[in-house]
């Protein structure tokens, strides 16, 4: 990918954009590409969106192949109407402490944040706002129909948390991790993100994993027993290796991914490890990226909604992972 | 009808300068890369310039690097090659080509402009 | 830089008669993207160049099916099964894999 060469692009004209997205000329100057977004990964050749005072973050300078769009130092936040500076902390609802840091938002709960499984005794458990609270509270009744077409794909679920206690104080820090988001493509390869200050200086930094919730050429509804609805951990007959903008992983990996149903529900992480990948590109050049790996995933019908801005964007996040 | 019409050739004096001019016309002129290429009399052809849809990337012959600058206004649908210090081997016709970006370099040519460095 | 080799220089070929020319590279012509970026310009006498051939074996709106374009590697061939008379002139392969992009020395086709 190197810009030395003579430009050629793809024979098709250029790409049309969905509304909002810049058309702009990749990192050589050969080609039209629609520009990465905010927490999109980003190479030379595909580049993060300058309208937006996006830049390509690659992390350790040995890892300029691929990168995450980042907003520049300081950048604010634009959250539900309200413009945060960077650094600003705020009560977005009665639910959520989060903080605005160089254009991205990082959330932490303030509500129980359990995962309910079916049970004989509650097969359908769903969170329900009873008045006069704030946090949601599982109840247990007979589902609405649900009137479906196809499987529910989701990368958003609820997860068990097992990062480092919110609260923990280190040597006069107030550590404070946010949970990892949801991963940003419901399948195929993704960026996970989070805000933490969990370092030497005490101070605020996202991370970024990559993410794979299901491959996008599994077709899953075939693997669903007769008289079921669901398949929740489908089996990977075998190994595979993670592909990344061209480079693949040097390892194969028995990893796990979620599977779907055909009744409305979601299938989505329930419990997740992050260890690190490494990926050789075709010019032999290898770089290590940190990743997401699926231990359990639960179904549920507690599928993300757009009707609440915070909710859809922030609550049905992967939360924690475990060691 | 696609059209690619070259002026500002002529007769120059070593070390002299030119403009050449290209006016583009039956298509849409800011969806294609432009190009400059020569041929000496009597002589093959010689890939010289080009530019991208915009104008903010130019690939150039490494020897005329530091004589020959190509340009672009898609305003006026024009592609422009500034030659300076001319020299005696600089002599050619000089025809201007739409470059496709994509599968095909040169699908559409100019008449050519014919530059003569003599003193 | 990469030398285009063409052979032969000149060809003289009857009407209706096949031709081919062959045009060699100094290295492998495959751009980074994957593709090979070959191609073949015919210039008529006191004429511009142009298009016949790209990207090997393609041919360029309006070129007549009797060319056709093949090779890989270093090693390309232009064939004109049925030679016209309208066919007569400077027939030049060009690479565009990488710079400097360059064209071969041409061959001259005559009608016998």
């Known amino acids: 990918q190197n810009c030395s060469g003579p430009c050629r692009c793809p024979d098709e004209p250029a790409p049309r954009c969905p509304a909002g997205v810049s058309l702009v000329l990749d990192g050589c100057g050969c080609c039209r590409v629609c520009a990465k977004q905010l927490g999109e990964l980003c190479t030379e050749r595909d580049p993060c969106d300058p309208h937006k005072g996006l830049f390509c973050d690659f992390g350790s300078p040995a890892n300029r192949k691929i990168g995450v769009c980042t907003a520049k130092d300081g950048a604010p936040c634009i959250f539900g109407g309200t413009v945060y500076r960077s650094g600003e902390s705020f009560q977005s609802s009665c639910k959520y402490q989060c903080t605005c840091l160089d254009g991205a938002v990082g959330c932490m709960p303030l509500c129980s944040m359990d995962v309910r499984l079916p049970s004989p005794d509650c097969p359908f458990p769903r969170r329900v706002k009873l008045p006069g609270k704030c946090c949601e509270e599982w109840v247990c009744d007979e589902p609405k129909d649900q009137t479906v077409v196809g499987p529910a794909l989701a990368a958003y679920r609820l997860e068990d948390t097992f990062g480092p206690d919110p609260t923990m104080i280190r040597a006069n820090c107030l550590v404070q991790t946010t949970e990892w988001s949801a991963c940003s493509k419901t399948c195929g390869m993704g960026i996970s993100t989070r805000v933490t200050n969990d370092n030497a200086s005490c101070r605020l930094e996202k991370q970024s994993r990559l993410c794979m919730v299901r491959p996008c050429e599994a077709d899953l509804e075939e693997n669903i027993k007769k008289g079921k609805k669901c398949i929740r951990t489908p089996k990977i007959s075998k190994p595979i290796k993670f592909e990344l903008s061209g480079c693949t992983s040097m390892k194969t990996y028995r990893a796990k991914f979620c599977g779907v149903c055909t009744d409305g529900r979601c299938c989505t992480p329930h419990r997740t490890t992050t260890l690190p990948v490494e990926f050789k590109c075709p010019d032999g050049e290898v770089m290590k990226k940190n990743m997401m790996f699926i231990k359990t995933c639960a179904c549920h019908y507690n599928c993300p909604g757009d009707n609440d801005i915070f909710e859809s964007l922030y609550y049905r996040k992967m939360y924690g992972d475990m060691a | 009808e696609v059209q690619l019409v070259e002026s500002g050739g002529g007769l120059v004096q070593p070390g002299g300068s030119l403009r050449l001019s290209c006016a583009a016309s039956?298509?849409?002129?800011?969806?294609?890369?432009m190009a400059w290429v020569r041929q000496a009399p009597g002589k093959g052809l010689e890939w010289v310039a080009n530019i991208n849809y915009e104008g903010s990337r130019t690939d150039l012959l490494e020897s005329l690097k530091s004589r020959f600058t190509i340009s672009r206004d898609n305003a006026k649908n024009s592609v422009y090659l500034q030659m300076n210090s001319l020299r005696a081997e600089d002599t050619a016709v000089y025809y201007c080509?739409?470059?496709?970006?994509?599968?095909?370099?040169?699908?559409?040519w100019g008449a050519g402009t014919t530059v003569t460095v003599s003193s | 830089d990469i030398v285009m080799t063409q052979t032969p220089l000149s060809l003289s070929v009857s009407l209706g008669d096949q031709a081919s020319i062959s045009c060699k590279s100094s290295q492998s012509i495959v751009h980074y993207n994957g593709n090979t970026y070959l191609e073949w310009y015919l210039q008529k006498p006191g004429q511009s160049p142009q298009l016949l051939i790209y990207?090997?074996?393609s041919r360029a709106s309006g070129v007549p099916d009797r060319f056709s374009g093949s090779g890989s590697g270093t090693d390309f061939t232009l064939k004109i099964s049925r030679v016209e008379a309208e066919d007569l002139g400077v027939y030049y392969c060009f690479q565009g894999s990488h710079f400097p992009l360059t064209f071969g020395q041409g061959t001259k086709l005559e009608i016998k």
């Open positions: 039956g298509f849409t002129f800011s969806d294609y890369y």
């Open positions: 990207k090997v074996s």
């Open positions: 080509a739409r470059d496709t970006s994509r599968g095909s370099y040169f699908d559409v």
